[in-house]
């Protein structure tokens, strides 16, 4: 088990499942296919993970190395303010938006972007390696 885990950290643990990438103390899954935001969330939850919640600028910068111009869904939504799926507010980065219908968050190599939630995009799941209670 990952010991002493919480919403943002995992202890050193075994490697990640197939097709998941280990980075720091977490496993990340970068999808090949595209889904809308809700379907992407469901995909992650079904694999004991969650749509990517980024804890700080450092993690964001590290992840952006693996991203292209193509946007990927992350666990960020605008519900009377931009919040991560763990309930924490977005406070370390700006998100670009141009419309009231853009209430879901995505990321690419250049930063965060709001999008309408029904658009099919790639997505990123995050979890602790193998058996762990933490989702974020």
């Amino acid at each position: 088990l990952c010991q002493g885990s919480n919403y943002s950290t995992c202890a050193s643990c075994p490697s990640c499942p197939d097709r998941w990438m280990k980075y720091g103390n977490h496993c990340y899954y970068f999808s090949v296919e595209e889904k809308d935001w809700n379907s992407s969330l469901e995909f992650c939850l079904a694999r004991d993970s969650h749509l990517l919640v980024i804890t700080d600028n450092q993690e964001m910068s590290l992840l952006q190395v693996f991203l292209s111009e193509a946007f990927c869904w992350i666990g960020l939504r605008n519900n009377s303010g931009w919040r991560w799926e763990d309930g924490s507010p977005l406070n370390f980065s700006r998100i670009s938006s141009n419309s009231f219908v853009q209430t879901c968050g995505a990321i690419n190599k250049n930063g965060l972007q709001a999008s309408s939630c029904e658009v099919p995009l790639h997505w990123v799941c995050k979890k602790c390696p193998f058996a762990d209670q933490a989702l974020f």
Epitope: S99, Q113, S116, C117
Partner: antibody
Framework: DVKLVESGGGLVKLGGSLKLSCAAS????????MSWVRQTPEKRLEWVAT????????YYPDTVKGRFTISRDSAKNTLYLQMSSLNSEDTAVYFC???????????????WGQGTSVTVSS | DIQMTQSPSSLSASLGERVSLTCRAS??????LNWLQQEPDGTIKRLIY???SLDSGVPKRFSGSRSGSDYSLTISSLESEDFVYYYC?????????FGAGTKLELK
Amino acid sequence: DVKLVESGGGLVKLGGSLKLSCAASGFTFSSYYMSWVRQTPEKRLEWVATISNSGRSTYYPDTVKGRFTISRDSAKNTLYLQMSSLNSEDTAVYFCARDRDYGYTYEALDYWGQGTSVTVSS
Amino acid sequence: DIQMTQSPSSLSASLGERVSLTCRASQDIGGSLNWLQQEPDGTIKRLIYATSSLDSGVPKRFSGSRSGSDYSLTISSLESEDFVYYYCLQYASSPLTFGAGTKLELK
């Protein structure tokens, strides 16, 4: 040519209900968000509702939330607005309009219908 | 809600004259603004979207610009068919809100 034709307006009693329709042609209806906007007798424009291309997402201002329902039938290329608990402030000309969503960019209200008049009387 | 303060409410001008209408946004709308034209018969047409992009078929005499929270529609040389109503619309934030309108009249 893009064409939007509203119908269903008329005189309705205070507290009554009415359903407006908007027949769309000249574009792929299922690819576009659609909206309803009204114009009061004082010529003020007010946004009423927006629906996504799939119909899964709907958006309303607080003034009509819970009273009005926007819906669409892509097989019939038709947009609807079901209005209930109507009051005098709902008296207006109701326009349907087309919106385009590209995910990260949104083009609001690019084509408009000619409008249908709704009068709420006591 | 974001208030869109449109000015002037009416404007008298001559054929060939250059005029500007302005909408001031009470909060940041990041350029998410359209300009609409309404003819006497009620027909509404979008002229400009996203602050400065001209819709297809709209004459080049129409242009849009931004300075901070002020958004402007400029008509470089007025023609007879331009003497109608104009509205701005912000779509950055819900609810969508419109300016109160400008009536352009022939002097």
